[in-house]
């Protein structure tokens, strides 16, 4: 489980080495907590293991275990990062039959500076 509307420490081992250490759920895919996100991330492990893009780990963590700042703001990955990773890994994605979630389609994400990310409020995004 997770604390409602507050940032929580990252517990997904793969993402514990990221430059951020707090996250918030649900994520972009609507995964309710870190244990679900970790299981769903496993489909992408061949990409991460083979490092098809230098940014693959960062992107997967930002997508599945998003950065949380100012208590209730979730920071989705930026579009440029998504485009770079998708183009680097496209052939592996196809050869390994990895389903790219609709919510992570790059044209759904916003252009932003990775160092000053765009945030969205999960209250309105997920709770309508």
């Amino acid at each position: 489980g997770h604390s409602l509307f507050t940032c929580e420490p990252i517990t997904v081992p793969r993402c514990m080495k990221m430059a951020y250490n707090m996250t918030f759920f649900p994520n972009l895919m609507g995964h309710y907590d870190q244990s679900i996100a970790a299981v769903e991330m496993e489909h992408f492990l061949p990409l991460a293991n083979l490092e098809c893009s230098p940014n693959i780990e960062t992107f997967l963590c930002k997508a599945f275990v998003p950065t949380c700042i100012e208590q209730i703001h979730v920071v989705p990955p930026c579009r440029k990062l998504c485009e770079k990773v998708y183009s680097d890994c496209k052939k592996l994605i196809d050869t390994f039959g990895i389903r790219w979630p609709e919510e992570l389609e790059c044209d759904r994400l916003q252009y932003c500076d990775e160092t000053v990310p765009v945030t969205f409020d999960p209250h309105t995004e997920f709770l309508g």
Partner: antibody
Framework: QVQLVQSGAEVKKPGASVKVSCKAS????????MNWVRQAPGQGLEWMGI????????SYAQKFQGRVTMTRDTSTSTVYMELSSLRSEDTAVYYC??????????????WGQGTLVTVSS | DIQMTQSPSSLSASVGDRVTITCRAS??????LAWYQQKPGKAPKLLIY???TLQSGVPSRFSGSGSGTDFTLTISSLQPEDFATYYC?????????FGQGTKLEIK
């Protein structure tokens, strides 16, 4: 022309480890992923895992996770496959196979000649 | 993992015969299928990729067809050098998997 030349046959005791090498030539070594596939006597082909020769990163079939290690040496254009805790069922011919780039997908376009590993007490 | 099932597992035919080998995937794999030929004591050799595209240097008597779950390899007129074992392989899902093989023997 593309060539993958593997090390010679090995006989090992149960519980031991074996390290098979595959030396590539005739193409840019770091531009193509390399796979390892094995074939038990009279049996079909079984994929073991893959290594990226540029970065050395790997992905292994679940069945071999924890027992297999794939490495590479870019200075000699060689990839290695080490299998530990050998048992009799690991007796097989082990092949390295290059992943060729065919449009949208990868296929195994060049294969080494194979290395027979026999596990017997 | 996707299971690949080939039929028949062995087949006897004569030089000049037309031969068809089938391969069925346990789930749809689009057209991400390859066929390999293996002769005794030798490594497999890529014959066909993307279901129907002949690898460079492969004779035109070999052809492939199908999509989704059902695929075929056809040899229009068997030559003596075609007697071998043939494997299908899918590359549409992790991990890549092979059929169990079809051994083509001289009648």
């Amino acid at each position: 022309q593309v060539q993958l030349v593997q090390s010679g046959a090995e006989v090992k005791k149960p519980g031991a480890s074996v390290k098979v090498s595959c030396k590539a030539s005739g193409y840019t070594f770091t531009s193509y992923y390399m796979n390892w596939v094995r074939q038990a006597p009279g049996q079909g082909l079984e994929w073991m895992g893959i290594i990226s020769p540029s970065g050395g990163s790997t992905s292994y079939a679940q069945k071999f996770q924890g027992r297999v290690t794939m490495t590479r040496d870019t200075s000699t254009s060689t990839v290695y496959m080490e299998l530990s805790s050998l048992r009799s069922e690991d007796t097989a011919v082990y092949y390295c196979a290059r992943w060729g780039d065919y449009g949208d997908l990868y296929y195994f376009d060049y294969w080494g000649q194979g290395t027979l590993v026999t596990v017997s007490s | 993992d996707i299971q690949m099932t080939q039929s028949p597992s062995s087949l006897s035919a004569s030089v000049g015969d037309r031969v068809t080998i089938t391969c069925r995937a346990s789930q749809g794999i689009s057209s991400a299928l390859a066929w390999y030929q293996q002769k005794p004591g030798k490594a497999p050799k890529l014959l066909i990729y993307a279901t129907s595209t002949l690898q460079s240097g492969v004779p035109s008597r070999f052809s492939g067809s199908g999509s989704g779950t059902d695929f075929t390899l056809t040899i229009s007129s068997l030559q003596p050098e075609d007697f071998a074992t043939y494997y299908c392989q899918q590359v549409n899902s992790y991990p890549p998997t092979f059929g169990q093989g079809t051994k083509l023997e001289i009648k």
